[in-house]
């Protein structure tokens, strides 16, 4: 699957503590970005930014911060973004991924519950036979 747009981290210049190495075939490994002149690979800052693939990004990508109403499943590393999940009792729909919504507490009259509330889906109700 193809990767979609994300914000660049606002680091214009490599801080002295950032490790440097040489690009391979003009690309830098996951956890790094490339310098403006293309001569160096500069490490991303742990917990602040990351890159997931071999790349020639001029800046690493800013780590996601979990919203209130979300729990952090795994922290941001230099090679992987934060993984956030909706808190228990709430879910995130594919068509509105920006927020967690409360799961319904029960099914309408004449329907029966066949699926529980999960972080990615509301309860599932079907008509009684």
């Amino acid at each position: 699957a193809l990767i979609t747009q994300q914000d660049l981290a606002p680091q214009q210049r490599a801080a002295p503590q950032q490790k440097r190495s040489s690009p391979s075939e003009g690309l830098c490994p996951p956890g790094h970005h490339i310098s403006e002149d293309g001569r160096d690979c500069i490490s991303c800052k742990y917990g602040q930014d990351y890159s997931t693939h071999w790349n020639d990004l001029l800046f690493c990508l800013r780590c996601t911060r979990c919203d209130s109403g979300e729990v952090e499943l795994s922290p941001c590393t230099t090679t992987r973004n934060t993984v956030c999940q909706c808190e228990e009792g709430t879910f995130r729909e594919e068509d509105s991924p920006e927020m967690c919504r409360k799961c319904r507490t029960g099914c309408p009259r004449g329907m029966v519950k066949v699926g529980d509330c999960t972080p990615w889906s509301d309860i599932e109700c079907v008509h009684k036979e």
Epitope: S24, G38, W54, D56, L57, L58
Partner: nanobody, 126 residues
Framework: EVQLVESGGGSVQAGDSLRLSCAAS????????VGWFRQTPGKEREFVAA????????YYADSVKGRFTISRDNAKNTVYMQMASLKPEDTAVYYC???????????????????WGQGTQVTVSS
């Protein structure tokens, strides 16, 4: 924020030419390489071509080699793709992309990108 804006798409006859443009606003392209992908309904985006803005090195998918030419104008922050000898199978939405992402450094074909334009439709009829 990196913003990529494509233009130049349209409807042409087989054998005709078109030139697509990709202009970057904001923090320029955010990467050294800039590329083009294309997508037809129901299929994944496929890589078409890329260029290194520093030294002009180019990369092409086999399906367009010899027909499409990618170039850049760094002063205008723009990348172009000249498409010649167009075929009906070139019909697609064409996307400009930056921050190309690869599984291995030796790979010539990116698996995706961080930044995408909104796409421009190219229709080639026979």
């Amino acid at each position: 924020e990196v913003q990529l804006v494509e233009s130049g798409g349209g409807s042409v006859q087989a054998g005709d030419s078109l030139r697509l443009s990709c202009a970057a606003s904001g923090r320029t392209f955010g990467s050294i390489r800039v590329g083009w992908f294309r997508q037809t309904p129901g299929k994944e985006r496929e890589f078409v071509a890329a260029i290194n803005r520093n030294d002009g090195t180019t990369y092409y998918a086999d399906s367009v080699k010899g027909r499409f030419t990618i170039s850049r104008d760094n002063a205008k922050n723009t990348v172009y793709m000249q498409m010649a000898s167009l075929k009906p199978e070139d019909t697609a939405v064409y996307y400009c992309a930056a921050g190309l992402q690869y599984n291995r450094s030796a790979d010539r074909v990116p698996v995706g990108a961080v930044y995408w334009g909104q796409g421009t439709q190219v229709t080639v009829s026979s």
